[in-house]
């Protein structure tokens, strides 16, 4: 009769056994054992006993201990198993953001491990327990899924392997994946709104707004705002589940035309996005051209108003004949235009918005001196000893200067409060001059005196 | 003992599809994964794709996406790998190899190889 | 994907006398588990490469103990500590860390 010993050994993968084997008749013929395994007798007394040492065991075997007695032939076998971790354990990759509402799939795959009878994979949220099934296949895959909550919002999932070799006087084995951290989002259906001018005038600063409720995590949520090819660099506030992104924008002549601005909020794996057309325009003020600004009385001016190509103007309230960028008038100087506001008003059509320009100059006319009876009255009578302002107003452009003399050297004290004397009374020059000539006027001071009453 | 036998050599033309065969005996089928290796003369052994036995999965090596169809018959205990589009440069021996889905552990047991020629 | 450097391309070795090839790799085969997924293999003329070490530095199963294998990283050496008739043939090592999983060019060894 042949004995093994152990009849049954777990041993790690790699790991080197002891095997006893064992007759019952003293004297056997053949004691020995089978196996493809490496093995190496080690020497004892005795004819009826042989130990053997079983290396580098890589899997299962059933190494088989024989002898052949006067009574016959006998064998019997030893149950070699071999137990080795897992080598991987994984859970198949996924987006780290997931939708609130979606279901997302966990996929765990392990790669090896012994016997697959103690193996057991078990799918976790945190250390709450999603899944456990036994480790079948390879890879063994196990599922399970889960429907994507806000408050999973920063969960992390695992898997992890339990190899229990405890009834077999072992340990528990644990290996456990990297963890996938899951990232939960809510990006509305709803587009972000965009407030922004429809039109912008070249070398001016707009200012443009998007915004958008309902949004989860909010602080996550990227901003994207652009005009053409130029990125905004906006201010972003941010509400509980909102944020509003403020930008300036400024154009050049080189972005004229009709420009896109877009406005993009990424979230998780996720984008809404608002277009919106701004055009941009180059609209200088009109022109407003005099023949010379500062002309003499009489001279003929012609005034011009000239605007942008597609603008319609008026010059003084008067459109242009035919209507268009271009209008002018003639006249010929009084000195009633010295002064005169000529006011040009342009009207360009931009993207159905009508904007006014105006541009305004003003003439200047060269004319005089004048004294005329009006203004500078010939003759004075006043009473002795009275108190009277002489007037006298030259007019002109420049203004004269104006001097009234007596013999030549007693002057009249024009404009000054005088008490009335004898030697007032007599007959002045008036003399207005300017850079535009001179003129005279006589002017006569009678004094009455009391006597005479 | 454990043993994988392929189908036998194969000649085709430029492009030809091929399917060969790899039997396995010897362990549970289901419970090692199934690699393709193949070996273009003067060239280094260059690996295709891997099986699971268990549940039909596959990946393949991204140089043979789409001209590779890896399939299972486990009734059969066989697994199979079929190459569409054949050109000259896939001239090679074609080896079925056992392991673990990953190879971690290495290609332990390996067929006889296949010889395939691609010749017009 | 990862290239792996053997050296020599050949050896030839004096029977009983020992041999070591190596294998450097073009980027780390330490994998995120900590494991290193770097394996060797023995193609004997007209025959299939036979597994002899798996990661690193295991013996597979009926690989005589004069086979070691050795390093970390990206440099690898095979050892045979006495070379024997029957070890002729080419030497590949191979990596299963990173995907596409790649071999080395090989290496001959031939008796002197």
């Known amino acids: 009769q042949t004995s093994v010993s152990p009849s049954k050994v777990i041993l790690p993968r790699g790991g080197s056994v002891l095997v006893t084997c064992s007759t019952s008749c003293d004297q056997p013929k053949l004691l020995g054992i089978e196996t493809p395994l490496p093995k190496k007798e080690l020497l004892l007394p005795g004819n009826n006993r042989k130990v053997y040492e079983l290396s580098n065991v890589q899997e299962d075997s059933q190494p088989m201990c024989y002898s052949n007695c006067p009574d016959g032939q006998s064998t019997a076998k030893t149950f070699l198993t071999v137990y080795w971790t897992p080598e991987r354990v994984e859970l198949a990759p996924l987006p780290s953001w997931q939708p609130v509402g979606k279901n997302l799939t966990l996929r765990c795959q392990v790669e090896g491990g012994a016997p697959r009878a103690n193996l057991t994979v078990v799918l976790l949220r945190g250390e709450k327990e999603l899944k456990r099934e036994p480790a079948v296949g390879e890879p063994a895959e196990v599922t399970t899924t889960v429907l994507v909550r806000r408050d999973h919002h920063g969960a992390n999932f695992s898997c992890r392997t339990e190899l229990d070799l405890r009834p077999q006087g072992l340990e528990l084995f644990e290996n456990t994946s990297a963890p996938y951290q899951l990232q939960t989002f809510v990006l509305p259906a709803t587009p972000p709104q965009l407030v922004s001018p429809r039109v912008l005038e070249v070398d001016t600063q707009g200012t443009v707004v998007c915004s958008l409720d309902g949004l989860f995590p909010v602080s996550e949520a990227q901003v994207h705002l652009a005009l053409g090819d130029q990125r905004l660099n906006p201010t972003v506030t941010y509400g509980n589940d909102s944020f509003s992104a403020k930008a300036s924008v400024s154009v050049t002549a080189e972005d004229e035309g009709t420009q896109r601005l877009t406005c993009a909020v990424i979230l998780g794996n996720q984008s809404q996005e608002t277009l919106q057309t701004v055009t941009i325009y180059s609209f200088p003020a009109p022109n407003v051209i005099l023949t010379k600004p500062e002309v003499s009385e009489g001279t003929e001016v012609t005034v011009k108003c000239e605007a942008h190509p597609r603008a319609k103007v008026t010059l003084n309230g008067v459109p242009a004949q035919p209507l268009g960028p271009r209008a002018q008038l003639l006249l010929k100087a009084t000195p009633e235009d010295n002064g005169r506001s000529f006011s040009c008003s342009a009207t360009l059509e931009v993207a159905g918005q009508l904007i006014h320009k105006n541009q305004t100059r003003e003439l200047r006319v060269l004319y005089g001196p004048r004294l005329d009876e009006r203004d500078c009255p010939g003759n004075w009578t006043w009473p002795e000893n009275s108190q009277q302002t002489p007037m006298c107003q030259a007019w002109g452009n420049p203004l004269p200067e104006l001097k009234c003399l007596k013999d030549g050297t007693f002057p009249l004290p024009i404009g000054e409060s005088v008490t009335v004397t004898r030697d007032l009374e007599g007959t002045y020059l008036c003399r207005a001059r300017s850079t535009q000539g001179e003129v005279t006027r006589k002017v006569t001071v009678n004094v009455l005196s009391p006597r005479y009453e | 003992q454990v043993q994988l036998v392929q189908s036998g050599a194969e000649v085709k033309k430029p492009g030809a599809s091929v399917k060969v065969s790899c039997k396995a005996s010897?362990?549970?089928?289901?419970?090692?994964?199934l690699h393709w290796v193949r070996q273009a003369p003067g060239q280094r052994l260059e690996w295709i794709g891997v099986?699971?036995?268990?549940?039909?999965?596959?990946d393949y090596n991204q140089k043979f996406r789409g001209r590779v169809t890896m399939t299972r018959d486990t009734s059969a205990t066989t697994a199979y790998l079929e190459l569409s589009s054949l050109r000259s440069e896939d001239t090679a021996v074609y080896y079925c190899?056992?392991?673990?889905?990953?190879?971690?552990?290495?290609?332990?047991?390996w067929g006889q190889g296949t010889a395939l020629t691609v010749s017009s | 994907d990862v290239v792996l450097t053997q050296t020599p391309l050949s050896s030839p070795v004096t029977l009983g006398q020992p041999a070591s090839i190596s294998c450097r790799s073009s980027?780390?085969?330490?994998?995120?588990?900590?494991?290193?997924?770097l394996h060797w293999y023995l193609q004997r003329a007209g025959q299939p490469p036979r597994l002899l070490i798996y990661?690193?530095?295991n013996r597979f199963s009926g690989v005589p103990d004069r086979f070691s294998g050795s390093g970390a990283g990206t440099d690898f050496t095979l050892k045979i500590s006495r070379v024997e008739a029957e070890d002729v043939g080419v030497y590949f090592c191979?990596?299963?860390?990173?995907?596409?999983?790649?071999f080395g060019g090989g290496t001959k060894l031939e008796i002197k």
């Open positions: 190899a056992r392991s673990l889905y990953f190879g971690s552990s290495g290609f332990d047991y």
């Open positions: 010897g362990y549970t089928f289901t419970d090692y994964a």
């Open positions: 099986i699971s036995t268990y549940s039909g999965n596959t």
């Open positions: 980027q780390t085969l330490v994998y995120r588990n900590g494991n290193t997924y």
């Open positions: 990661k690193v530095s």
């Open positions: 191979s990596q299963n860390t990173h995907f596409p999983y790649t």
